[in-house]
């Protein structure tokens, strides 16, 4: 069966939107009005992995681009990157481990935990226009909570 996907945008708990910053990086900043058109639209695919009521494995691709968020070890540190893939083969139900995130719903907020690096989360900084990154702490200064807006 083909993998089920939906299109959405994400905003962090401070209501910052995610936009492209160069070819292989996302940054988070406040957008208003027509500038909201800059925000990236994700193709969120529901993939194979350990699932529970509040934890669902997903892959996060960029709509109409052959780019996926992936988590790899760089200089011995878990790192978030945008990775190019062959569009003929993606998305697929069985994604490689580095592409899988556990979408965790808590109090109407979403967290995205790396399946490859447990307790590491897609994160944004409090500061404006900083890169989206993989962070190893929750509840600290960095933001790990998001809301999702469906896009038709």
């Amino acid at each position: 069966a083909p993998v089920r996907s939906l299109h959405c945008t994400l905003r962090d708990a401070q209501l910052k939107s995610l936009v492209m910053s160069g070819p292989y990086e996302l940054k988070a900043l406040h957008l208003q009005g027509q500038d909201l058109e800059q925000q990236v639209v994700f193709s969120m695919s529901f993939v194979q992995g350990e699932e529970s009521n509040d934890k669902i494995p997903v892959a996060l691709g960029l709509k109409a681009k052959n780019l996926y968020l992936s988590c790899v070890l760089k200089d011995d540190k878990p790192t978030l990157q945008l990775e190019s893939v062959d569009p003929k083969n993606y998305p697929k139900k069985k994604m490689e481990k580095r592409f899988v995130f556990n979408k965790i719903e808590i109090n109407n907020k979403l967290e995205f935990e790396s399946a490859q690096f447990p307790n590491w989360y897609i994160s944004t900084s409090q500061a404006e226009s900083m890169p989206v990154f993989l962070g190893g702490t929750r509840g600290g200064q960095d933001i790990t909570d998001f809301t999702m807006q469906f896009v038709s």
Epitope: Q48, G49, E50, V72, L73, E83, S84, V85, D86, N89, K94, E96, K97, R98, A115, Q116, F117, P118
Partner: antibody
């Protein structure tokens, strides 16, 4: 020191089954990011990745196997298994287990291999 | 599946020579490539990972380079213990696939 030791190989007729074991020491398959794979090598041929299991139980298989093989683990016994069913002559090979950590994979430590012969 | 093609299949060289083995992928595999050495009757040994990172304990005469779809393993000055078969492995996409191997033999 990391060690992996394969066992369970032998001769079997086409259509038969075998279960290979990979007993390991020096690391734990409950450590996040840890994985163990099976790689085989037909006599005089190259290497072919067969299957893989991650610390969290996530499994992957080479689609060329068409669902005939199943990988599993017993974390408490430090052992990974490869159940091979509906064996064919082309499954004749040395089967190695190997350890990796994280995706993308590279196999850091290997066992010495166990030989599987499928022949009538 | 991603096809990995190694060249040459066999390479004759002498001690002290500089040799290069090439591995080509059928599509872009980023830098998700590793190299292994195997001697007859033995298990493979990891030499290089992430295209160019030397595995611990591997002599510095071994080096790796490349990106995208073309990669090389270079041995700067062949030693007697280097005569073996060498394989590349791509980790970009499942199923993970090896090159067919390059046998390095004494000239």
């Amino acid at each position: 020191e990391v060690q992996l030791v394969e066992s369970g190989g032998g001769s079997v007729q086409p259509g038969g089954s075998l279960r290979l074991s990979c007993a390991f020491s020096g690391f734990s398959l409950s450590t996040s990011g840890m994985g163990v794979g099976w790689i085989r090598q037909a006599p005089g041929k190259g290497l072919e990745w067969v299957s893989h299991i991650w610390w969290d139980g996530d499994e992957s298989y080479n689609p060329s196997l068409k669902g005939r093989f199943t990988i599993s683990k017993d974390t408490s016994r430090n052992t990974v298994y490869l159940q091979m069913n509906s064996l064919r002559a082309e499954d004749t090979a040395s089967y190695f287990c190997a350890r990796n950590r994280y995706d993308p994979p590279w196999f850091v430590d290997w066992g010495q291999g166990t030989t599987v012969t499928v022949s009538s | 599946d991603i096809q990995m093609t190694q060249s040459p299949s066999t390479l004759s060289a002498s001690v002290g020579d500089r040799v290069t083995i090439t591995c080509r992928a059928s599509q872009d595999i980023s830098n998700y490539l590793s190299w292994y050495q195997q001697k007859p009757g033995k298990a493979p040994k990891l030499l290089i990972y992430y295209t160019s990172k030397l595995h611990s304990g591997v002599p510095s005469r071994f080096s790796g380079s490349g990106s995208g779809a073309e990669f090389t393993l270079t041995i700067s000055s062949l030693q007697p213990e280097d005569f073996a078969t060498y394989f590349c492995l791509q980790g970009k996409m499942l199923p993970w696939t090896f090159g067919q191997g390059t046998k390095l033999e004494i000239k």
